[in-house]
Every structure is written in C-alpha cells, then in structure tokens.
C-alpha cells in the first residue's frame, strides 16, 4: 500500500503490470485483466444504498499517485490499496471501510427537546 | 548489449516433444517480459503468448493456449517454449523478443522442422 | 482480435524517392493509459525483425532519422523520406494494446 508522506513523482515501469479487474475493467481488457505503465488497485465504497462494494483494476501512472493515497473524503466511506510487486497483485488487497464517525449518523442539526 | 540467444535448429518427427530456448543477458532478465513470436514459413508475425520471469505470470494467445507452454528460470536468464506432441504445422521459426511496452529486441531465431 | 491492415502489400520506390506504408486496426488503438500502442518494425532476409518505430512516432535508438511514424486511432503511417539501398526489407506493423498483440500481414519493399 502506498504510505500517505509519499510524496515524489512516481517512476516509470520498464514493463507492463496486468491486473484484476472487477466493475472497472476498460475496453482494452480481456478476460478481466487489463494492463497499465502505474498501479493495480482494489477499492471498496459504499454505494447510494449503504452497501459495500468492491471494484477492482488498473491505475494508470498519470495521477495514480494521488488516488493510491487514500485522501479521505468528507461524507463519502471509501478505501483504496494499490500495489506493483507482482502481476495481479490486487486479488490480495482487502481494503476495509473506514468506521463510521459519529457525525455520519447525523442528517441535519440536532433538535433537544 | 542486450543480447536474446536461442538454442539451435531442430528437425522432430510428429509426436514427439521439444522446449527450446532464449537466454537473455546485457539487462535485467525480470524487469522485461519475454514473448515468443511465429514465422511460418514465407509467412507474417504471430504473438504466441508472453511470460513475466519476475513471477512467472504468462499469457497466451487463445489460439495458441493449449499448444504450447511458455516457462522461464530467471536464476538463468532464460525462457523456454515448449510442445508436449508436435504436429507438421507446427514448422516454422520461432522468436523470442523482449516486451516492456512494445518488443525492442529479438533473439536470431530457432528454426523447428517437423516431418515424418 | 484486433486485424492490422497493411497497404500496400508490396511498394517499389525508387532510390532516394519518398515511401509510404499505411497501416489500419480494426479498432482503436488508443490504450486505457492514454498511450497508443502501435509499432514498426523492419525485417530483413534471414533476419530477426528489428524495431524501427515504437509508440506511434518516436525513432528507436540507432535508427536513421529517414524514417518517421504517424498516425492516431486507427490510421497510421510509416514514412521513409529517402529511399535507400538497404531499407529493402519487409515492414509490419504491429499493436501492444490489445492483448492477443497483433502484426499487420507486411509490405514488402523494393527498389525501382
């Protein structure tokens, strides 16, 4: 997993990574594996129902280094784990969902009686 | 130098089985893929299939999964394709080739002949 | 799989005179990363291919700067501005971004 103080410009792969990919699969894959110069990645997120759902594919290296972060963002439950070490190296990421925070119960202000 | 040597020449009968070789050198043998390539005979280019010698993560052509196996030993720097029963349409020549993103070097050749 | 179209399948040019090599796939080439991931390559008799043109445009090392690639998509072009004696060879293109990775059927090259 990529550590959050990471912050230098991520090096060029001198070959193609193939990975996993579930719910986020591009044209150019086959047989849910897709290929990148970056990241394989496994995500998980609630979606507009509260249920945990979890994608899975490739990174491309433009940008991947921000989105393998895990900036967390305000409302939205989500984790993301992103690894190079070996082909298909997302089959064993199991990101977990962040626990729910007090105020994630809360729709508006609350009301004493 | 990026260097791709195959193993020799070979004349088979049908049935019978046969690995050849591709041992590279002058680069770091795991951090390229190593793909093999056919020529028929006064034919074009066919991708067989590729093997990840870091991890050993291969991938085929479907046309030729089944036909051949792709392995490698990085300890030795070196890929192999193999047939476990060779067939007559199995004479061509026969390329290894290094892949990072496209093919930049390829071994000379092994020409394989199968005939009864 | 992706079919590379070559044209023509043969070209007799002249020495020192302008040749061109189109080549067309059946779909786009244009990988998830962004990168298109189309090649050329020359093979001589009795030789191995050698790489001539990777990623579309961009020369590999040690090849002369008379030939130069082109293209977007679907459409791509290889271009030797002037001929010379040992570009008589047999030319393929080739795409890396749909696996299984496929040559166009070649051109052969020829002087006039």
């Known amino acids: 997993k990529k550590e959050d103080g990471e912050s230098t410009a991520p090096t060029p792969r001198p070959k193609v990574l193939r990975c996993k990919c579930h719910h986020h699969c591009p044209e150019d894959s086959v047989n849910n594996i897709c290929s990148t110069d970056g990241y394989c990645f496994t995500m998980i997120e609630e979606d507009d129902s509260g249920l945990p759902v979890v994608t899975s594919g490739c990174l491309g290296l433009e940008g991947s280094d921000f989105q393998c972060r895990d900036t967390p963002i305000p409302h939205q439950r989500r984790s993301i784990e992103c690894c190079t070490e070996r082909n298909e190296c997302n089959k064993d990421l199991h990101p977990t969902l962040p626990p729910l925070k007090n105020r994630d119960f809360v729709d508006g202000p609350i009301h004493h009686r | 130098e990026v260097q791709l040597v195959q193993s020799g020449a070979e004349v088979k009968k049908p049935g019978e089985s046969l690995k050849i070789s591709c041992k590279g050198s002058g680069y770091s043998f795991t951090s390229y893929w190593m793909q093999w390539v056919r020529q028929m005979p006064g034919k074009g280019l066919e991708w067989m299939g590729e093997?990840?010698?870091?991890?050993?993560?291969?991938l085929y052509n479907q046309k030729f999964k089944g036909q051949v196996t792709i392995s490698a030993d990085k300890s030795i720097s070196t890929a192999y394709l193999q047939w476990s029963s060779l067939k007559a349409s199995d004479t061509a020549m026969y390329y290894c080739?290094?892949?990072?993103?496209?093919?930049?070097?390829w071994g000379q050749g092994t020409t394989v002949t199968v005939s009864s | 799989d992706i079919v590379m179209t070559q044209s023509p399948d043969s070209l007799a040019v002249s020495l020192g005179e302008r040749a061109t090599i189109n080549c067309r796939s059946s779909q786009s080439l244009v990988h998830s990363t962004g990168n298109t991931y189309l090649h050329w390559y020359q093979q001589k008799p009795g030789q191995p291919p050698k790489l001539l043109i990777y990623?579309?445009?961009n020369r590999f090392s040690g090849v002369p700067d008379r030939f130069s690639g082109s293209g977007s998509g679907t459409d791509f072009t290889l271009t030797i501005s002037s001929l010379q004696a040992e570009d008589v060879a047999v030319y393929y293109c080739?795409?890396?971004?749909?696996?299984?990775?496929?040559f166009g059927q070649g051109t052969k090259l020829e002087i006039k």
């Open positions: 080739s795409q890396s971004t749909h696996v299984p990775f496929t």
């Open positions: 093997i990840d010698p870091s991890d050993n993560y291969t």
């Open positions: 080739a290094r892949f990072g993103y496209y093919v930049d070097y």
């Open positions: 990623k579309v445009s």
